[in-house]
């Protein structure tokens, strides 16, 4: 390692620079000038090795105001300028650019494919159970149950279009009324937002990146939850969605048109259907109480079949079941009749991996779940890496300015609405809000898109997915056209209502603030992100489902006190932050409660205790993977995944000490200090522990 140059005005006490020194001056990093987004991790170094030097000028100054951690990092270009390159360098640069673009598109393709396979995996693991949720008769009378069923089914099958199509077929066959279907659609809207939240978890390795990515993903969740919180009671009271959509459906004489265009699927289907193909009808049949479907496999075996209508002799319980007396007879014991039976002749098998394995659905589902998550994770890491290397300097500036800059005054307010339209358009092109929002998540993480801009894009995505549903409804057969169109319109107007609630007035953009709050918590306590997922998408819906099954008295008996406590806490929190003097001294903060009830620190200690034994092997694995990855990328730099690094990071962050690591290849400490900048850690750091 290159020795650190002495500075004339260096800090006099050298012990401050030594490994294991008791304290360091608290230095506030200038987040706005962050060049990288990596963890604030300290690099483990051998005894007496010097840590980076800090300018005394910076130390003596009053602590500078801490910049907003949500400010986007500066993606600086460390490469040679185009004008300074020779012809060979320029050609090489062009080829590198083309290569990166091809790689980016390739990884993006596999990223989208893995999302599709992930959805199939979830359907194999939980599809049948999800179908059975629908066969619950209480949905009709209990909108809350409908809502949680919508959430759970969509979470289990990882596809709102699957749960929506089940609802449509149930409405079409009069098993469900439109009124009962609306809460399920609302729930499906919530459930679909889990996908990009899972994608955000993949960026957990870097605190600042994770903060942004997780907030960017959960802004979708909060929008949906808040919309339901307001609009479900309104719908139950007024039935406005049902009435409005019924008027629209009745006022038009629709003719079922062409099939909704499959745009992205055209490219991804050829690949995903080589992995697995599912018979989606099975889940619908289970939902519609078809007993025979419960024993059917979701894995499609025969892709080419010939359906023939034939008259078949079948036994019936009594003469009353005969199609007509003359078409009834007996064999002496049983009564027989002739019925038209559709006979399915299998012609050609499907061409996917699992076609000849005859594994149970659960086994196939688990295999695909693991593979798709690994591919998803790998693709995401590579997309982030490639984008990180591409989005530097001029390119980054142009992109960030284009995406995040508002229109000139007085049209600044229009920018967000344009973003909504862009989000809707992009979602319409990719035919899936999950795919669009999941692709958006890493861009938010690396700082290309602000959360403020991601929010309208996400809202647009919600609209886009409903326009796709409307088109699909218009293409559906006559018997399901009305119901599918009305449900698609309910979905559309629900999202429009949500946007009107939580977007036009900046003050009402609660989802952004809530997502940022969650992002901050999750960046500090990364385990909380998983807890959030489990609680909001599984525990709460399952609890409500269980209580609903127990009946209204139980649901109200448990629900009312819980809601009362939540409202009380929110009111108290509001008063504490806005006008604490109104409250008695004891209630001005939460210290009157046990620590575990108002802080995540004790919980963090407990979780660390449990996860501790797994960290060492995990870190070793991570270190090896990182080394391999870095070698493949041609950047053999530090992996900050070792236990000691993590311990040091946690410990120092607790003391309020910024963790720094030197740049491996460019000794730029002095030049940076000259600019009055204190760098956040860089991923390109030397790791002495390796």
């Amino acid at each position: 390692m290159a020795p650190w140059p002495e500075l004339g005005d260096a800090q006099p006490n050298p012990s401050k620079y030594l490994e294991g020194a008791t304290s360091q001056q608290p230095i506030t990093p200038d987040k706005s000038k962050e060049t990288n987004k990596t963890d604030n991790t300290e690099v483990p170094v051998t005894k007496f090795e010097l840590l980076p030097t800090y300018s005394t000028a910076t130390l003596i100054e009053e602590p500078t105001e801490v910049d907003d951690p949500w400010n986007l990092p500066t993606l600086q270009d460390s490469g040679i300028k185009w004008s300074e390159r020779d012809a060979k360098g320029k050609i090489l640069c062009v080829f590198q650019g083309i290569g990166r673009l091809i790689l980016l598109l390739g990884f993006l393709y596999f990223f989208v494919c893995s999302l599709d396979v992930l959805s199939s995996a979830f359907q194999l693991v939980g599809g049948k159970m999800a179908g059975q949720f629908f066969s619950n008769s209480s949905i009709m009378s209990n909108p809350l149950l409908g809502l949680v069923i919508g959430v759970l089914v969509t979470v289990f099958v990882q596809s709102s279009s699957t749960s929506t199509s089940i609802v449509v077929s149930m409405v079409a066959s009069s098993l469900l009324t439109v009124r009962a279907a609306i809460p399920i659609i609302m729930g499906a809207n919530i459930g679909t937002s889990i996908t990009n939240t899972i994608v955000a978890l993949m960026q957990v390795g870097d605190r600042s990146e994770f903060r942004r990515a997780f907030a960017g993903a959960t802004v979708h969740d909060f929008f949906n939850w808040l919309s339901v919180l307001v609009l479900l009671p309104v719908e139950v009271a007024t039935h406005y969605l049902e009435v409005v959509t019924q008027l629209i459906v009745e006022s038009f004489h629709f003719k079922n048109g062409e099939d909704a265009p499959d745009l992205l699927k055209v490219i991804t289907k050829p690949f995903t259907k080589l992995i697995v193909q599912l018979d989606k009808k099975v889940i619908s049949q289970i939902a519609m109480n078809d007993e025979t479907a419960k024993n059917k496999s979701l894995v499609k075996i025969w892709c080419k079949t010939f359906t023939n209508m034939t008259q078949m002799n079948v036994t019936v319980p009594s003469m009353a079941n005969c199609t007509s007396p003359s078409l009834c007879w007996t064999d002496g014991i049983q009564i027989w009749t002739m019925k038209n039976v559709t006979y399915k002749e299998n012609i050609a098998k499907c061409q996917h991996i699992f076609v000849n394995f005859h594994l149970p659905d659960l086994a196939v589902g688990i295999i695909l779940l693991i593979i798709s998550l690994l591919v998803l994770c790998g693709c995401l890491i590579m997309i982030v890496k490639i984008l990180g290397s591409v989005l530097k300097g001029q390119v980054a500036t142009v992109i960030k300015k284009t995406i995040n800059t508002d229109f000139p005054f007085p049209f600044a307010w229009l920018t967000g609405y344009l973003a909504i339209l862009v989000g809707a358009g992009m979602t319409f092109i990719v035919q899936s809000s999950s795919v669009f929002t999941s692709a958006l998540t890493p861009l938010i993480g690396i700082g290309v898109i602000t959360i403020e801009r991601a929010y309208p894009l996400t809202l647009g995505s919600n609209i886009g997915t409903t326009t796709t549903a409307i088109l699909a409804a218009l293409a559906s057969p006559g018997n399901t056209l009305r119901s599918s169109l009305q449900i698609a319109l309910c979905h559309f107007f629900f999202n429009i209502s949500g946007i009107l609630l939580w977007y036009p007035i900046p003050f009402t953009r609660l989802p952004i603030r809530m997502a940022k709050g969650l992002g901050n918590i999750s960046a500090k306590y990364r385990w909380f992100a998983i807890f959030y997922l489990i609680i909001f998408f599984f525990l709460i819906p399952l609890t409500v489902f269980g209580l609903s099954l127990a009946g209204w008295p139980v649901l109200v008996g448990v629900g009312v006190p819980v809601v009362f406590i939540i409202i009380l806490v929110l009111c108290l929190r509001l008063l504490q932050s806005r006008c604490p003097r109104v409250l008695p001294k004891k209630l001005q903060n939460w210290n009157f409660l046990p620590l575990c009830m108002h802080s995540l620190k004790p919980w963090d200690a407990v979780i660390s205790k449990f996860t501790g034994p797994f960290q060492m092997p995990c870190c070793c694995c991570c270190r090896v993977c990182c080394r391999v990855c870095c070698l493949l990328c041609g950047c053999p730099k530090c992996c900050r995944c070792s236990k000691c690094c993590q311990d040091l990071e946690e410990g120092q962050e607790a003391q309020g000490v910024p963790v720094k690591a030197p740049e491996t290849f460019d000794n730029i400490t002095i030049s940076r200090e000259a600019q009055g900048e204190v760098r956040a850690p860089d991923s390109k750091t030397e790791c002495t522990a390796l």
Partner: antibody
Framework: QVQLVQSGAEVVKPGASVKVSCKTS????????MHWVRQAPGQGLEWIGA????????AYNQKFKGRVTLTADKSTSTAYMELSSLRSEATAVYYC????????????WGQGTLVTVSS | DIQLTQSPSFLSASVGDRVTITCKAS??????VAWYQQKPGKAPKLLIY???TRHSGVPSRFSGSGSGTEFTLTISSLQPEDFATYYC?????????FGQGTKLEIK
């Protein structure tokens, strides 16, 4: 080829019981119904009842119910008809006949067993 | 119970004649009718089922027709071995019932 071989002629006293057997071969015993038909001397054919050996399900003509019991032994592919509380008018030739699958026509018949009820 | 009435009860014919036997049902039986041939001291033999379908091994001179309540068995050209008693049977509903029989004799 399908064969139905019935037990030999029986002479029984009034009030007694008799069990006629019908041993089958040449087909899967459990897939077809086994019908029993009687023919009194110089008279027409009369359906007694049927048994489905696969499940043991039976159906009887009300006229004979309570006095006829049909059984089947899958292990030996043999069907049995037990006649109880016999009266002189029960004297007849009793046939076992295989029912065609899915309907009540009888395609293969046993040679018949003459049961004579006399004191 | 469904009653089947065969006519005639006795029929005299010569070899090579065309013979028709009729069977009437007391109610609609669709096409659930079978025809049997029985020779003295022998078990009945299935000729026709589903009113018109010839059983395997049955000569083509035997044919069946009809549906609902009226059925006929036709022997297009009588052969010496065809002289026997013929029975119709319905299997539209339990109990299965037979006609009283038609005895075909040599003239």
């Amino acid at each position: 080829q399908v064969q139905l071989v019935q037990s030999g002629a029986e002479v029984v006293k009034p009030g007694a019981s008799v069990k006629v057997s019908c041993k089958t071969s040449g087909y899967t015993f459990t897939t077809n119904n086994m019908h029993w038909v009687r023919q009194a001397p110089g008279q027409g054919l009369e359906w007694i009842g049927a048994i489905y050996p696969g499940s043991g399900a039976t159906a009887y003509n009300q006229k004979f119910k309570g006095r006829v019991t049909l059984t089947a032994d899958k292990s030996t592919s043999t069907a049995y008809m037990e006649l109880s509380s016999l009266r002189s008018e029960a004297t007849a030739v009793y046939y076992c006949a295989r029912g065609m699958y899915g309907h009540g026509a009888m395609d293969y018949w046993g040679q018949g067993t003459l049961v004579t009820v006399s004191s | 119970d469904i009653q089947l009435t065969q006519s005639p009860s006795f029929l005299s014919a010569s070899v090579g004649d065309r013979v028709t036997i009729t069977c009437k049902a007391s109610q609609d039986v669709g096409t659930a009718v079978a025809w049997y041939q029985q020779k003295p001291g022998k078990a009945p033999k299935l000729l026709i089922y589903w009113a018109t379908t010839r059983h395997s091994g049955v000569p083509s001179r035997f044919s069946g027709s009809g549906s609902g309540t009226e059925f006929t068995l036709t022997i297009s050209s009588l052969q010496p071995e065809d002289f026997a008693t013929y029975y119709c049977q319905q299997y539209s509903s339990n109990p299965l019932t037979f006609g009283q029989g038609t005895k075909l004799e040599i003239k």
